[in-house]
């Protein structure tokens, strides 16, 4: 299926140009999306092009500036947040990135009613996290690992926790591993729906081993960065959940929420918290061996001022074929009765689907079914449930939004997006206003992305929010590559692939092939999305064919494919890339003497193992920030898929699946190894060990490090990286510079 027709007529050919590397590095062809910042059922905020914060009312069609760009500029604000009572706005400046989600910032409060900044009892700086209560204008914030509460922005703060200590005790914010591998947020505190209670997590990292690496900076001596980071099998953080009454915080103080007995009997994780009502909360827990998850619904006991989690309100989710959930265990979406909920988990056929749980998981009512997967529940209202899936036309790499009418019996299902802009839009997400009165659809491709506003009752399109006209015009004279998404059937395994072909692709000619791989558990690379990136350039200008293949271990095609890699990372992911390459060669247009593979992070691990597979298929390859041994990576992620690195568990495969063990096999390939020295995620240690093993085996290879760069290799390093990799590939493929 050709998703992007070349739009080239012969007469126009000479006015068209290929993509350049400069185009990619400059972000010339980047697109915009429009996510409304909903503040009610029919109103949203948006930052205009001139940086005013504008409030839009869909029903009246009116808009007005609630915060002037002059005010934003006066504190160099890069972000804002309106209090629910609309009286105050916090302005965020001095953004300083920490890890993937976390950052510190300076916060200023602007009083919209008085038209000036709040001066009394100013917030300390830098703050690690700050948020408004869901109602009114209470503030909760984390400063120096402790949580504070303000009843009003100008009031003095009330200190909730006192034991916070850098790298030791974290209150209201996650430690490194919880941030990256469990919560995927910068915060670990949650307001109850009306702001009566504030729940928070406390992480105790006292006994966690520390990863230490040098940060070279500009000083005479490098700094040492120390992060409590549990690698596979190491001691983990100890987590506790507390809830405090924010109306009378000093009255009884924080109350701990009990952990279910079956969880507390051995090492465990807290995975998420969902408020149901002001006096009912739902906590999810996970055993360290991550195939058992417990969802616990707890109620406030007014008489004792404590939280009670009866065993009858514990729901167990267990996997017998792999780990619990997909990448994470899914979170519940509660219905209006405040006890039953909707949740995505595997059905009896091994496909992730929406289930309705009223009393027990065993009696769950399956809401969706089929050989496809429900991916996200966006919103449940009195009469509708909105979700996304990859059901339509059996393409796993698509996302459409569906509505199930739960108010009628039998429930009827409608695809909201399937036929809206069928060629242009096959991969959607959505953002809903209160009560799903309105929603925005954001289409990511395969055509140029477009964001639209819709009526939540009729699904009628109200207006286009962003259609990327400028991008469309800019691309008119660009020779974009062609893209096709197809599948290979091999030994009862379906391998979906995306092939990116040069603009004047001719099946009778031979082209160099580059495999781009990620391949991590529960990932998906073959998606119907728009992108003009480095591989687009390689196809457009350098005439390469690029392929992405979703093999075993990847997501949204059922548990058989997903859990195939359980306890065996580094085997089937690599096999499936190799199998796909052989099939591509059979297609007749690949020059089998010029095949390369590259990947980043997990993809760097897979590309390294593929290069060292001894097949002779690959001439060269690149690994950027690869994992080299699962003993070096984070406990929460690694153990989910690999178990523990102990003799009586899975130590043998931990040892067998390292890149170092295959050092000898790199002798007949050109290998480029790249890593940032300040990588907090996949530590430089991984590449250092690969390099050491290659040196010890006397195998020649190329390497590049990026001083003081993390896992993202951002800024000027990005330009250097892609320029360097381009030269490497062109040399490998004997393409003139």
């Amino acid at each position: 299926i050709v998703l992007r027709p070349s739009r080239v007529h012969n007469s126009e050919e000479n006015t068209m140009r290929a993509l350049t590397l400069k185009d990619i590095l400059n972000g010339t062809f980047s697109y915009k999306t429009f996510f409304p910042n909903w503040i009610s059922g029919q109103e949203y905020l948006h930052q205009s092009a001139d940086n005013n914060i504008v409030l839009y009312n869909i029903e009246t069609g009116q808009s007005y500036t609630i915060l002037s760009n002059r005010t934003m500029k006066s504190v160099n604000a890069s972000n804002y947040g309106l209090s629910p009572d609309r009286q105050f706005v916090y302005l965020e400046s001095d953004y300083s990135k920490l890890w993937r989600y976390s950052y510190t910032a300076t916060y200023y409060i602007y009083d919209l009613s008085n038209g000036e900044f709040v001066r009394g009892n100013e917030l300390p700086r830098p703050i690690q996290y700050l948020c408004w209560s869901p109602v009114g204008s209470k503030l909760a914030y984390v400063y120096q690992n402790n949580i504070y509460l303000k009843q009003r922005p100008g009031d003095p703060p009330f200190q909730i926790t006192f034991n916070g200590r850098e790298n030791k005790i974290f209150n209201g914010i996650p430690d490194w591993v919880y941030e990256e591998e469990m919560l995927a947020t910068k915060y670990a505190l949650w307001w109850s729906p009306n702001g009566k209670f504030l729940a928070y997590a406390e992480f105790n990292d006292t006994d966690i081993p520390v990863i230490a690496y040098s940060y070279y900076g500009d000083e005479q001596y490098p700094r040492t960065i120390n992060i409590p980071y549990p690698k596979a099998g190491a001691k983990n953080p100890v987590v506790r959940i507390f809830i405090i009454d924010t109306t009378y915080p000093a009255y009884v103080g924080p109350q701990e929420v009990p952990v279910p007995a079956m969880i507390a009997s051995s090492d465990y994780y807290f995975s998420w918290l969902t408020w149901v009502t002001d006096e009912r909360v739902c906590l999810q827990w996970l055993k360290r061996v991550q195939n058992v998850s417990v969802l616990s619904i707890c109620d406030f006991r007014e008489d004792w001022q404590t939280w009670d989690c009866p065993k009858t309100q514990e729901h167990i989710e267990e996997s017998r074929t792999g780990w619990a959930g997909g990448f994470f265990v899914s979170t519940p979406v509660f219905s209006y009765d405040a006890i039953s909920y909707y949740k995505i988990f595997s059905d009896k056929d091994g496909y992730k689907h929406i289930h309705y749980i009223k009393d027990t998981v065993e009696n769950a009512i399956q809401i969706t079914s089929g050989k496809w997967e429900a991916i996200n529940i966006f919103r449940v209202t009195q009469d509708s449930l909105f979700y996304s899936s990859n059901e339509f036309e059996e393409y796993p790499g698509r996302r459409n939004i569906y509505r199930i009418s739960i108010g009628s019996y039998p429930p009827s299902k409608k695809c909201v997006t399937c036929h809206l802009r069928k060629e242009r839009c096959q991969y959607y997400t959505a953002s809903f206003s209160d009560y799903a009165k309105y929603y925005a659809l954001v289409c990511y491709g395969p055509g140029i992305p477009i964001s639209t506003l819709h009526d939540g009752r009729t699904d009628q399109e109200i207006k286009i929010l962003e259609e990327n006209k400028e991008l469309e015009n800019a691309l008119k004279n660009i020779q974009l590559p062609k893209e096709e998404i197809k599948k290979l059937e091999v030994d009862e395994i379906t391998l979906w692939y995306k092939m990116i072909l040069p603009p004047q692709f001719d099946r009778s000619k031979k082209y160099p092939l580059l495999i781009q791989v990620y391949g991590g558990p529960c990932s998906q690379s073959v998606r119907s999305v728009f992108a003009v990136n480095w591989i687009s350039y390689l196809a457009s200008k350098e005439g390469m064919v690029i392929a992405l293949v979703d093999g075993r271990g990847t997501a949204f095609q059922g548990d058989k494919l997903l859990y195939a890699v359980y306890r065996k990372l580094g085997v089937y992911e690599v096999e499936d890339q190799i199998t796909a390459v052989r099939k591509f060669i059979e297609m007749g247009f690949i020059d089998e003497k010029r095949i390369a593979i590259w990947g980043w992070s997990y993809g760097g691990y897979v590309s390294s193992l593929a290069l060292a597979s001894g097949t002779g298929l690959f001439k060269c390859g690149i690994a950027v920030a690869p994992v080299s041994s699962w003993e070096y990576y984070a406990s929460v992620y690694t153990e989910r898929f690999m178990g523990l690195p102990t003799k009586d568990d899975n130590l043998e495969h931990y040892k067998n699946s390292t890149v170092m063990a295959r050092a000898e096999y790199f002798r007949n390939v050109d290998y480029l190894l790249i890593h940032g020295t300040a990588d907090d995620n996949v530590h430089f240690q991984n590449s250092a060990q690969i390099a050491k093993a290659l040196v010890n085996a006397q195998v020649d290879f190329q390497a590049m490090w990026y001083s003081d760069q993390n896992h993202g290799l951002s800024g000027l390093s990005t330009n250097h990286l892609y320029t360097h990799m381009t030269h490497f590939l062109k040399q490998c493929f004997s393409l003139s510079d």
Epitope: S68, L112, G120
Partner: antibody, heavy 124, light 113 residues
Framework: QVQLVQSGAEVKKPGASVKVSCKTS????????IHWVRQAPGQRLEWIGG????????NYNQKFKGRVTITVDTSASTAYMELSSLRSEDTAVYYC?????????????????WGQGTLVTVSS | DIVMTQSPDSLAVSLGERATINCKSS????????????LAWYQQKPGQPPKLLIF???TRESGVPDRFSGSGFGTDFTLTISSLQAEDVAVYYC?????????FGQGTKVEIK
Amino acid sequence: QVQLVQSGAEVKKPGASVKVSCKTSRYTFTEYTIHWVRQAPGQRLEWIGGINPNNGIPNYNQKFKGRVTITVDTSASTAYMELSSLRSEDTAVYYCARRRIAYGYDEGHAMDYWGQGTLVTVSS
Amino acid sequence: DIVMTQSPDSLAVSLGERATINCKSSQSVLYSRNQKNYLAWYQQKPGQPPKLLIFWASTRESGVPDRFSGSGFGTDFTLTISSLQAEDVAVYYCQQYFSYPLTFGQGTKVEIK
């Protein structure tokens, strides 16, 4: 010359409500917030509350919260202050005053122009 | 709330003489960010609304005679009339606009001796 012209004197019974208007002219209405201040006989000036004409968001002194409602009609460049559940101690002269909006972090302005005042008498 | 206390409650000064009024705030009205004191002085004559004389503790409003001056820092402030004129007979109020609620002093009545 900037003008803030208030409505005339009112005599009200206890428990009743009063609504005082403040019509402004000769300046850009949306560049200033409007505040209401009262002065009971022999008493100090007492701030009641204010409103931002750009967004219609009011801010009230906690002492009056629940009894006072401040609104604006931007098209008429007029602000209103309504006080309900009147009692004898609400007998006072009620003033409106303007205060420049502070866009910058270092700004902050005093009330530079005041209305002529409206005498509200609460008596049974 | 910030409480403003003026002294004296009343003051009788001969024409041409100096009049000094003090104002004390229960907490600082000095803003560390810009080193400005968020304090104003108003003059109110019988049957008239207050008139702004001084803002930021020491800046004269345009059109205000230079015999009026303000000084002070943090919590202690002074309004000085260097040479009292007959038209200066009025009640003078200090007001903080550092934080809400905005609060006024109880007023100082200035008369001619």
